[in-house]
């Protein structure tokens, strides 16, 4: 099997890829300075911590999650990369356009890298539902429609909803499923005959999938808690965000043993079930009261998430052509929901006092700003999957899906390396 | 004891610029938040700025956006408002307050728990 | 916006004085009420509606939600003859009252 791009990729990825890295550096030249007011090293430092963990979580965590493929898994990792790079890139030319701009210049802070690689992150969820499937060049394409579609999904919130940061960066988990879910829906499905075993896991990649879980897992605390406005608020986002996460470990891994006739424990359910946790408490994780409760979202992200994975897979596959391996989109499309459906229920309980129009109106606006994170979500995302179907882009052909040494030069060209 | 100490104000030309300082004792500026709020002669209380308690987010009113600069130094644990292009509407007596805040059940109050006693800025020709 | 009345009041000591804060739109339970005397630093009465700030007499109460709020003073002594001020911390900016101004009868 060739190793080479064909030609016409070949000339496509590195003038597509390079002409946009040369216009970004334009963009940044003219439109970007850094912060210049005074602040001292330890203040930096803490803050830097922040976004370094979001990184980790982003390069490591979400790289490795995705490379459990047999015969993808550099691809995977690699292409995650590539895809944070360009996406951190552009989410803070964005969001400095779209917040800033009017004041003049874009002003770089950490807290812009930060909020950027957030941004960034939800195209490598996305993502997980259409690897294998797509080149680089097609990649780019998603990771500039996807973040310019969540930027201005934040700034509209922001601005009709007058929400806070936190609160509309936690439709990103939404957002991200159904923009992920729209994209494969459009690509072409039925993988031919032949290739069935490259779409299947393999016990080495699986084990670096089971070690970017871990780094998920670890981080998830981090990214639950970056955007909060006080220390006490942040506090209490990474306690519960842990103890929901712990919890749905357990619940992982037991409700796997549960679900398979012969108790054994699946390594695809447990590698997204050990975050559900993190994603069912992402909205509300600052005002959960108790630990019990985060516990209980815990336990109920990870039986949702181990009975996704359980029944949702062959439905996923038949329509979306997703393949077993990739339950991230359906995973969080699920665990999101849960999660703002706890806020709706929060919100209510909070309007309780203020009589019943304002309840209806509360939920109303709430309900409102899910639905537009969704609606923007799949119509961002079927724009992306037509965008990608276009013959420019020169796609891998069906047989050379989940491959990857249609994309990597390999010494010694093995099947099974 | 909890305190905020103004200075910084005085008079000034339209079009001028103003540091404004903010000294804090009894707490860190690296675990509060900080608001820079003013009050114009015969006027009500108007907030001005406001910095995250780890520095990573500034927010300003409308009025100020562009012209006014809220920055910390935690070293010093003093808070500043820098303040450029001044007009006669940026008269006022200039207050610094600590932001805090208590859980609600589907978001968090802030509120100002300690104010200081003000320093005056006046811009006149 | 947040619409304070009346705007200026008088009354005399031992009276119960009520000063109300109207919300343009709702703002549940997240109005803050303070204290202000000439020349000195704002002070914290009330925040989140109803809860008294720590060394604030007991004669100041807070009440209501939605968009209707009352700042009570039960037993008006002395040192309470100042300007008043609710603040609402729902949504950003952070906008107050125009004030209500208690001086003696």
């Known amino acids: 099997m060739s190793s080479k791009y064909p030609r016409s990729v070949r000339r496509c990825l590195p003038l597509w890829a390079l002409t946009l890295e040369a216009a970004l550096i334009l963009l940044f030249y003219f439109f970007t300075h850094y912060d210049a007011s005074l602040e001292d090293q330890k203040g930096l430092v803490a803050s830097y911590q922040v976004g370094q963990d979001l990184t980790v979580m982003a390069a490591i965590g979400l790289g490795f999650l995705t490379s459990s493929f047999r015969r993808h898994s550099w691809s995977s990792v690699a292409f995650n990369l590539f895809m944070l790079a360009l996406g951190v890139q552009w989410a803070i030319l964005l969001d400095g356009f779209l917040s800033q701009f009017p004041s003049g210049k874009v002003v770089i802070t950490l807290f812009s890298i930060r909020l950027a690689t957030m941004s960034a992150l939800s195209v490598l969820i996305s993502v997980d539902a259409v690897l294998g499937k797509v080149n680089l060049a097609q990649l780019v394409v998603m990771v500039l429609v996807e973040v310019t579609a969540l930027g201005n999904l934040r700034m509209v919130i922001s601005n009709i909803f007058n929400t806070d940061y936190h609160m509309n960066m936690m439709h990103i988990y939404v957002f991200a499923a159904y923009f992920g879910l729209s994209v494969a829906w459009c690509l072409p499905k039925p993988l031919p005959e032949g290739t069935e075993d490259k779409d299947q896991t393999a016990t080495i990649p699986s084990l670096s999938a089971m070690l970017g879980a871990l780094f998920l897992w670890m981080f998830w605390p981090s990214f639950n808690s970056a955007l909060l406005r006080s220390p006490i608020e942040r506090k209490n986002a990474v306690f519960n965000t842990y103890y929901a996460v712990a919890v749905s470990v357990v619940t992982a891994i037991s409700g796997s043993s549960l679900a398979h006739p012969q108790g054994k424990i699946s390594k695809t359910y447990v590698h997204s079930a050990v975050l559900a946790g993190g994603v069912a408490v992402g909205t509300s994780c600052h005002l959960i009261p108790s630990p019990w409760l985060a516990m209980v979202l815990g336990l109920v992200a990870g039986l949702i998430s181990v009975g996704g994975a359980k029944y949702l897979p062959g439905c996923c596959n038949r329509v979306l052509g997703i393949p077993h391996s990739s339950i991230m989109g359906y995973n969080f499309s699920l665990l999101g929901l849960l999660g703002e459906i706890i806020y709706i229920v929060l919100l209510v309980l909070d309007t309780v006092g203020a009589g019943n129009g304002m309840i209806g109106f509360q939920v109303l606006l709430s309900i409102g700003e899910l639905s537009l994170a969704i609606v923007i979500a799949l119509m961002s995302g079927l724009l992306t999957g037509l965008l990608l179907n276009l013959k420019i882009w020169k796609a891998p052909h069906e047989a050379k899906y989940f491959d990857d040494q249609v994309f990597w030069k390999f010494p010694h060209l093995a099947v099974g390396f | 004891q909890v305190k905020l100490l103004e200075s910084g104000g005085g008079v000034v030309q339209p079009g001028g610029s103003l540091r404004l300082s903010c000294e804090a004792s009894g707490f860190t500026l690296r675990s509060s938040g900080m608001h820079w709020v003013r009050q114009a002669p015969g006027k009500g209380l108007e907030w001005v700025a406001l910095?995250?308690?780890?520095?990573?987010?500034?927010s300003y009113a409308e009025s100020v956006k562009g012209r006014f600069t809220i920055s910390r130094d935690t070293s010093k644990n003093t808070l500043y408002l820098q303040m450029r292009s001044l007009s006669a509407d940026d008269t006022a007596v200039y207050y610094c307050?600590?932001?805090?805040?208590?859980?609600?059940?589907?978001?968090?109050?802030?509120?100002?728990?300690?104010w200081g006693k003000g320093t005056t800025v006046t811009v006149s020709s | 916006v947040m619409t304070q009345s009346p705007s200026s009041l008088s009354a005399s000591i031992g009276d119960r004085v009520t000063i109300t804060c109207r919300a343009s739109q709702s703002i549940i339970r997240y109005l803050n009420w303070y204290q202000h005397k000439p020349g000195k630093a704002p002070k914290l009465l009330i925040f989140?509606?109803?809860n008294l700030q720590t060394g604030v007499p007991s004669r100041f109460s807070g009440s209501g939600s939605g968009t209707d709020f009352t700042l009570t003073i039960s037993d008006l002594q002395p040192e309470d003859f100042a300007t008043y001020y609710c603040q609402q911390s729902y949504s950003r900016p952070f906008t107050f009252g125009r004030g209500t101004s208690l001086d003696i009868k």
């Open positions: 989140a509606a109803s």
């Open positions: 910095i995250w308690f780890d520095g990573s987010i500034r």
């Open positions: 307050a600590r932001d805090k805040a208590v859980r609600g059940i589907s978001r968090y109050n802030y509120y100002m728990d300690v």
